[in-house]
């Protein structure tokens, strides 16, 4: 439905508080280097303008599109050329090219300082002194570091952030109350950001059809009692929401997400029996709850899939009449019967089915040709099952840290050209699959593990895309979204790699390592491990283990020494020499 003023429409729908928060997120996700104060100023100007349009929708410029209004506002930033370089060229373009240009310049790994958490008392004072500014700063800092963060969900995080400070700053032991909550928000936030990044990559790199297929599979698992037509409607609406958010249309996205939550709750009887609690919550909690809701129970007595998709004489006729719909029905029927499969596996099965129909329906005897199509699924199902079984056994044997190290070695050997920080970050996250998924029973392991790995490997893909260094990574990332994980799993040691020159500086450590948290210390050691493998890609597990054990002992010893710095200098030289000898460097 057309509105005379889009900005007034969204302001009225969302309310002033959400409107301002979403505009701040949008601006911070586009101009990631701009100071907080500059963004607040721009947001206030846009908000004042929106209010004039609410008062009179026919007022000057109120009929302009949101992209035009926001883009014009961003292009008033004085230091655009100095701060952002070629991004300033976007401002010479007209809409919609200008917005596309801004989107292309979003940086998944912006050069921003690490967020350091101040003392609890300092944070509580800041919170009490100016709650509004404190919360805006949170939105700004998260949005600029995560330019694809799902904006309506960030509002939910901000609400929880505020609740944590409201409660804990009054508590007797502020730190004991607040710090675990902030840790939880940080970890959940990183996970949420990574999940959304995959959705945006799916839409932007593989198109709407790929995203819709993912959504059909996931929603069919979640809502197995819903009819295909109902699932299709939800998929269409969900695709619109994510297309908007990934495209920077955050006001429309948040508005449409609210509408979708409303529709789901009004129609929960025909969607899922698990939605009741979610639908009693306020809007932000409700939307989050629906997105995370557990799978409903499968209907009893579902007929065999073979009847409609293999045995029916109408398979090719139905496929020819509406290919994507017929494949969608196949995916829906398969997914609702298999909550124990990962979404990516279901998509691989659907792709195999599609390829078979494309070949067989054009053949002389189609039925004879596709009669055994379900037999082709067996190896596709067994491959992730076996991989998960093996890796969970390894995880249970090693524990998380050493399991991460095994993956670090494995992935550094596969793609040694990738930067060390990226290899460490990605391998650490890959390693978290163990504690996240291996505790689950068999029926939940695959959807947990393989769909999580898809999210983590997408991080590798987006970071690598910024500065491509490996043809093998590019190939696995771009050829097929659903086959990324099997593609990386299948990579062997890169025999073409020329080992890195040995640099003693890389293995020089100082007393500051002693004051680091356990996590930071692990990262230091894992960074050294990656560098070792880059120097000696053919090093055996045993050799690497010996060097890493020596390294751990060296850190422990020097951190206990009276003169730590001297210990690190002297013992460090010995360690480097011993390691070189052990590895034959």
């Amino acid at each position: 439905d057309a509105h005379k003023s889009e900005v007034a429409h969204r302001f009225k729908d969302l309310g002033e508080e959400n409107f301002k928060a979403l505009v701040l997120i949008a601006f911070a996700q586009y101009l990631q280097q701009c100071p907080f104060e500059d963004h607040v100023k721009l947001v206030n100007e846009v908000t004042e303008f929106a209010k004039t349009c609410v008062a009179d929708e026919s007022a000057e410029n109120c009929d302009k599109s949101l992209h035009t209004l926001f883009g014009d506002k961003l292009c008033t930033v004085a230091t655009l050329r100095e701060t952002y370089g070629e991004m300033a060229d976007c401002c010479a373009k007209q809409e919609p090219e200008r917005n596309e240009c801004f989107l292309q310049h979003k940086d998944d790994n912006p050069n921003l300082p690490r967020l350091v958490r101040p003392e609890v008392d300092v944070m509580c004072t800041a919170f009490h002194d100016n709650e509004e500014t404190f919360l805006k700063k949170y939105l700004y800092e998260i949005a600029r570091r995560h330019p694809y963060f799902y904006a309506p969900e960030l509002l939910f995080f901000a609400k929880r952030y505020k609740a944590a400070f409201t409660e804990c700053c009054q508590a007797a032991d502020k730190a004991a109350c607040l710090l675990p909550k902030l840790d939880e928000l940080r970890d959940e936030g990183k996970a949420s950001s990574a999940k959304q990044r995959l959705k945006c990559a799916s839409l932007q790199k593989f198109g709407e059809r790929a995203f819709k297929a993912w959504a059909v599979a996931r929603l069919s698992q979640r809502f197995p009692k819903a009819e295909f037509a109902e699932v299709s409607k939800l998929v269409t609406d969900l695709t619109k929401v994510h297309t908007e958010c990934c495209h920077g249309d955050l006001l429309e996205c948040a508005d449409d997400r609210a509408d979708l939550a409303k529709y789901i709750c009004e129609n929960q009887d025909s969607i899922s029996s698990k939605l009741k609690e979610c639908c009693e919550k306020p809007l932000l909690e409700k939307s989050h709850c629906i997105a995370e809701v557990e799978n409903d129970e499968m209907p009893a007595d579902l007929p065999s899939l073979a009847a409609d998709f293999v045995e029916s004489k109408d398979v090719c006729k139905n496929y020819a009449e509406a290919k994507d719909v017929f494949l969608g029905m196949f995916l829906y029927e398969y997914a609702r019967r298999h909550p124990d499969y990962s979404v990516v596996l279901l998509l691989r099965l659907a792709k195999t089915y599609e390829t078979t129909l494309e070949k067989c329906c054009a053949a002389a005897d189609p039925h004879e040709c596709y009669a055994k199509v379900f037999d082709e699924f067996k190896p596709l199902v067994e491959e992730p099952q076996n991989l998960i079984k093996q890796n969970c056994e390894l995880f249970e044997q090693l524990g998380e840290y050493k399991f991460q190290n095994a993956l670090l070695v494995r992935y550094t050997k596969k793609v040694p050209q990738v930067s060390t920080p990226t290899l460490v970050e990605v391998s650490r996250n890959l390693g978290k699959v163990g504690s996240k998924c291996c505790k689950h029973p068999e029926a939940k392991r695959m959807p947990c593990a393989e769909d999580y790995l898809s999210v983590v490997l997408n991080q590798l893909c987006v970071l690598h895309e910024k500065t491509p260094v490996s043809d093998r990574v590019t190939k696995c990332c771009t050829e097929s979204l659903v086959n990324r994980r099997p593609c990386f799993s299948a990579l062997e040691v890169d025999e073409t790699y020329v080992p890195k020159e040995f640099n003693a500086e890389t293995f020089t450590f100082h007393a500051d390592i002693c004051t680091l948290s356990e996590k930071e210390r692990q990262i230091k050691k894992q960074t050294a491990l990656v560098e070792l493998v880059k120097h000696k890609p053919k090093a055996t597990k045993e050799q690497l283990k010996a060097v890493m054990d020596d390294f751990a002992a060296f850190v422990e010893k020097c951190c206990k020494a009276d003169d730590k710095e001297t210990c690190f200098a002297e013992e460090g030289k010995k360690l480097v020499a011993a390691s070189q000898a052990a590895l034959g460097l």
Partner: nanobody, 123 residues
Framework: EVQLVESGGGEVQPGGSLRLSCAAS????????MVWVRQAPGKGLEWVST????????RYAESVKGRFTISRDNAKNTLYLQMNSLRAEDTAVYYC????????????????WGQGTLVTVKP
């Protein structure tokens, strides 16, 4: 707005031939499967033939196999049905149709379709 306009019908003797055309507009013809269905006087709808978006997959009802040929020209947004060796039982109104989102595949009442063109086969 989806529009399907059939033409080419008429009266013909048994054993004769006709070529039906269907001009399509208002939707993505080149990515849509297309169907010919017919309705004989006093009877229900009967599926005749289906052609996929890229014309690689073609299906016919047993009653017309070997006599009718379905084809399409995606550049012209037009669907065809070449009917040879016509019989009295082929007398019907012929409709071209395409799947409409939200309807069941093969449930032709729910498809988009044209106003039809009458084919009469009589000696």
């Amino acid at each position: 707005e989806v529009q399907l306009v059939e033409s080419g019908g008429g009266e013909v003797q048994p054993g004769g031939s006709l070529r039906l055309s269907c001009a399509a507009s208002g939707f993505a013809f080149s990515t849509s499967g297309m169907v010919w269905v017919r309705q004989a006087p006093g009877k229900g709808l009967e599926w005749v033939s289906t052609i996929s978006d890229d014309a690689r997959i073609i299906r016919y009802a047993e009653s017309v196999k070997g006599r009718f040929t379905i084809s399409r020209d995606n550049a012209k947004n037009t669907l065809y049905l070449q009917m040879n060796s016509l019989r009295a039982e082929d007398t019907a109104v012929y409709y071209c149709a395409t799947y409409r989102a939200g309807s069941r595949i093969g449930s032709y009442e729910d498809y988009y379709w044209g106003q039809g063109t009458l084919v009469t086969v009589k000696p």
